[in-house]
């Protein structure tokens, strides 16, 4: 059982460890979003991606996640079993993003540009809200991430 | 070799109470989430509830909630449903499945057990 | 709450292309499954993740999921084809596993 995104192959990680985590906390990470209207992780994003893209994709995406969401918001809360959780996560991210290698030839530059549109689409939702509005409704959006990565996932 | 095999089933009369039960074998059953999914004569599959592989997390169809409750033992790589006032819409063929993904990838399915609720 | 909608029944000739289709809000941005219930048996996943195959399951299945209508493909339908067909989705919003209403497929 492994995740293959396009020519990338990522092994040991456990999905079942990675919902377990996000669901122990996403009641109160989607109680204390307010801001219903707007989306991260948009259509967009995640609509369509090809095998070849998803690599670079999923690569960008969880390096957001580890130095930009995680971090912050490790630094917010006390609360211990909202720690460990998000310490599953992280802890699972780093390692999928250490067997993710995207080629950086020249003939797959249209591939990656077009992934790192997408991320851009991302990352400018969340610099549209306020930083603790931003982190927050990131972590309630873990499911949404989740969810799409099923699709590169292999039995 | 994977097995998942239900028991429990009967002939229960309107706001009678049953306990389904799934025994696991041929796999690490606290590694799994869990699901039960029933289906009625002449209807089609119904998901019921499911259950995170800790036991931590357990989620209802609307149909189900305040009457059913999902448990495991994962010392007993045992599966359970507990249901309360039953009624006759809950007749049907119960299900177990095995999520291998946390999140509705049912990849194995037991045989079934029949529940009927009648007077 | 999510739904997925399919037709009641389709058909196809011995050896001809069938297609399920099975319709959903924006269901090509969740995970698509599909299971195949033939009468007094249990359901078997034929396909998962849109468009993956379970060990032992014929080539002749494939799927695809885009937009709003995920697609079941039998190539070649055989007569041990005939059967009920689900499809099904996790939504994460409701934390609930969706079913499609089911296809029958009757191969002439």
């Known amino acids: 059982q492994e995740f293959h995104f396009g020519p990338c192959q990522v092994k040991g990680v456990v999905p079942q460890k990675l919902w377990e985590a996000f669901w122990a906390v996403k009641d109160t990470m989607q109680a204390q979003d307010n801001i219903t209207s707007a989306r991260l992780l948009q259509q967009e994003v995640l609509q369509n991606v090809s095998d070849a893209e998803s690599c670079y994709l999923v690569h960008t995406l969880l390096e957001f996640y580890l130095k930009t969401v995680f971090k912050n918001y490790h630094n917010r809360t006390v609360e211990v079993r909202t720690l460990k959780s998000f310490s599953t996560l992280a802890n699972n991210f780093v390692l999928i993003v250490s067997q993710l290698q995207p080629s950086q030839e020249n003939e797959m530059f249209s591939i990656r540009d077009s992934a790192h549109r997408r991320f851009l689409l991302f990352r400018r939702a969340f610099k549209q809200l306020d930083v603790e509005a931003a982190l927050t409704k990131a972590l309630g959006e873990v499911d949404i991430l989740l969810t799409w990565m099923q699709k590169f996932y292999k039995l | 070799q994977l097995q998942l095999v239900e028991s429990g089933g009967a002939l229960v009369q309107p706001g009678g109470s049953l306990r389904l039960s799934c025994a696991a074998s041929?796999?690490?059953?606290?590694?799994?989430?869990m699901s039960w999914v029933r289906q009625a004569p002449g209807k089609g599959l119904e998901w019921v509830s499911h259950?995170?592989?800790?036991?931590?997390?357990?989620f209802y169809a609307e149909s189900m909630k305040g009457r059913a409750t999902i448990s495991r033992d994962n010392a007993k790589n045992t599966l359970y449903l507990q249901m309360n006032s039953l009624k006759s819409e809950d007749t049907a063929v119960y299900y177990c499945?095995?999520?291998?993904?946390?999140?509705?990838?049912?990849?194995?399915w037991g045989q079934g057990t029949q529940v009927t609720v009648s007077s | 709450s999510y739904e997925l909608t399919q037709s009641p029944s389709v058909s196809v000739a011995l050896r001809q292309t069938a297609k399920i289709t099975c319709g959903g809000d924006?269901?090509?941005?969740?995970?698509a499954q599909w299971y195949q219930r033939k009468p007094g048996q249990a359901p078997v996943m034929v396909i998962y993740?849109?468009?993956r195959r379970p060990s032992g399951i014929p080539e002749r299945f494939s799927g695809s999921n885009s937009g709003n209508t995920a697609t079941l493909t039998i190539s070649g339908a055989q007569a041990e084809d005939e059967a009920d067909y689900y499809c099904?989705?996790?939504?994460?919003?409701?934390?609930?596993?969706?079913f499609g209403g089911g296809t029958h497929l009757t191969v002439l």
């Open positions: 499945a095995k999520d291998d993904y946390g999140s509705g990838l049912y990849a194995y």
């Open positions: 041929g796999f690490t059953f606290d590694d799994y989430a």
């Open positions: 259950i995170s592989g800790n036991g931590e997390s357990t």
């Open positions: 924006n269901i090509g941005s969740k995970s």
């Open positions: 993740s849109d468009n």
């Open positions: 099904q989705v996790w939504d994460s919003s409701a934390n609930a596993a969706v």
